[in-house]
Interface confidence: low
């Protein structure tokens, strides 16, 4: 009775179970009676990352500099190349197929988390007592100036976009 299933790391050919090729190698010839499967190493620039019966290796991913990508880790015969974004950019999706500029936090919002190669800037509204008057991918909210500690008085209240304005103490009349 012909076989319909094989052990792990084997595959079925003409009712015969052949050993698969290991990661980093591709199939050249199926096994035949007493002759084992013939495999050959993937060429430079190619890979196979699983036990397989593939006739062709996969091309390594190309990290396209036009898209802001560069090689994070060179591929081997067993692993694909991994790409990451250039400084100042982050991936547009999980596969990191292209990159985009980090977002800026506008005035009134400060940077909660600085962007990385894989995640964008996270902004947070400045709470009472803090302000941000710039669009930035780096600046956190700054605390309002304390007029009192400078021996001054508050002339104008601060907002989430502006600092307090301090002025001199009014002179007391005799």
């Amino acid at each position: 009775e012909p076989r319909t299933a094989c052990r792990e790391k084997q595959y079925l050919v003409d009712s015969q179970c052949c050993n698969m090729c290991p990661p980093g190698e591709k199939l050249v010839n199926d096994c035949l009676h007493t002759i084992d499967t013939e495999c050959t190493r993937c060429q430079t620039g190619e890979f196979l990352d699983t036990w397989n019966a593939e006739r062709h290796c996969h091309q390594h991913k190309y990290c396209d500099p036009n898209l802001g990508l560069h090689v994070e880790k060179e591929g081997t015969s067993e692993t694909d190349t991994t790409c990451t974004c250039d400084e100042g950019l982050h991936c547009t999706n999980a596969a990191c197929e292209s990159c985009t500029m980090h977002s800026l936090c506008p005035p009134g919002l400060g940077v909660k988390q600085i962007a990385t190669g894989i995640s964008d800037t996270i902004c947070d509204p400045c709470p009472i007592g803090f302000f941000s008057n710039v669009s930035s991918a780096l600046e956190k909210c700054h605390p309002w100036t304390s007029c009192e500690t400078k021996g001054l008085v508050k002339v104008q209240a601060g907002t989430n976009k502006t600092d307090v304005i301090c002025g001199p103490q009014p002179r007391l009349r005799a």
Epitope: L67, G68, E87, G88, M101, A137
Partner: antibody
Framework: QVQLQQSGPELVQPGASVKISCRAS????????IHWVKQRPGQGLEWIGW????????KYNEKFRGKATLTADTSSSTAYTQVSSLTSEDSAVYFC?????????????WGQGTSVTVSS | DILLTQSPAILSVSPGERVSFSCRAS??????IHWYQQRTNGSPRLLIK???ESISGIPSRFSGSGSGTDFTLSINSVESEDIADYYC?????????FGGGTKLEIK
């Protein structure tokens, strides 16, 4: 307009170190790479490395790792390269140049160069 | 490291002639090549980026072509002010590398 203004020429003793500055103006300093390039007298251009002032991250040509140290001060929009343990091989003109964060964009603005002469 | 080979080392032409500079990469780099002009005692100046993209403010007589491993910078009508060294540079992978340069002389 975009400008990169480098510090003046330096005459330094062998074994000493030198710190060259590159002051940027006319653009957002934290959003572009600053690259450093070396040119020995009568020779071609050699890439030393880059710094991204927005993060402080650096990338060095292995040939210059331990020889050059790249830093940046965002408050003054100035990038620096310090070249240490100077020998006659370090006598050269050092250029800073700006590059967009997209990988394939070139070094579009260059400083005027700083001449370093190593001599006793 | 990617090796960039420029040829010839010296080019000598008459004003008005068309001239071509060659840059060959040791491996395929797509269009990640840029061309610079450096006059005597001056800083490099960007002429062409990404193999063929023109740069604002650079005369239209400068053009670039090529992809993969073979690249060319052309000046379609040489002027005396074009006397300079010309360098190609790749930004496909680190370390960035420059070609050895070609010196343009006027006959």
């Amino acid at each position: 307009q975009v400008q990169l203004q480098q510090s003046g020429p330096e005459l330094v003793q062998p074994g000493a170190s030198v710190k060259i500055s590159c002051r940027a103006s006319g653009y957002s300093f934290t959003s572009y790479y600053i690259h450093w390039v070396k040119q020995r007298p009568g020779q071609g251009l050699e890439w030393i490395g880059w710094i991204f002032p927005g993060s402080g991250n650096t990338k060095y040509n292995e040939k210059f790792r331990g020889k050059a140290t790249l830093t940046a001060d965002t408050s003054s929009s100035t990038a620096y390269t310090q070249v240490s343990s100077l020998t006659s091989e370090d006598s050269a003109v050092y250029f800073c140049a700006r590059k967009s964060p997209y990988g394939n964009y070139a070094m579009d603005y260059w400083g005027q160069g700083t001449s370093v002469t190593v001599s006793s | 490291d990617i090796l960039l080979t420029q040829s010839p080392a010296i080019l000598s032409v008459s004003p008005g002639e068309r001239v071509s500079f060659s840059c060959r990469a040791s491996q395929s780099i797509g269009t990640s090549i840029h061309w610079y002009q450096q006059r005597t005692n001056g800083s490099p100046r960007l002429l062409i980026k990404s193999a063929s993209e023109s740069i604002s403010g650079i005369p239209s007589r400068f053009s670039g072509s090529g992809s993969g491993t073979d690249f060319t910078l052309s000046i379609n009508s040489v002027e005396s002010e074009d006397i300079a060294d010309y360098y190609c540079q790749q930004s496909n992978s680190w370390p960035y590398t420059f070609g050895g340069g070609t010196k343009l002389e006027i006959k």
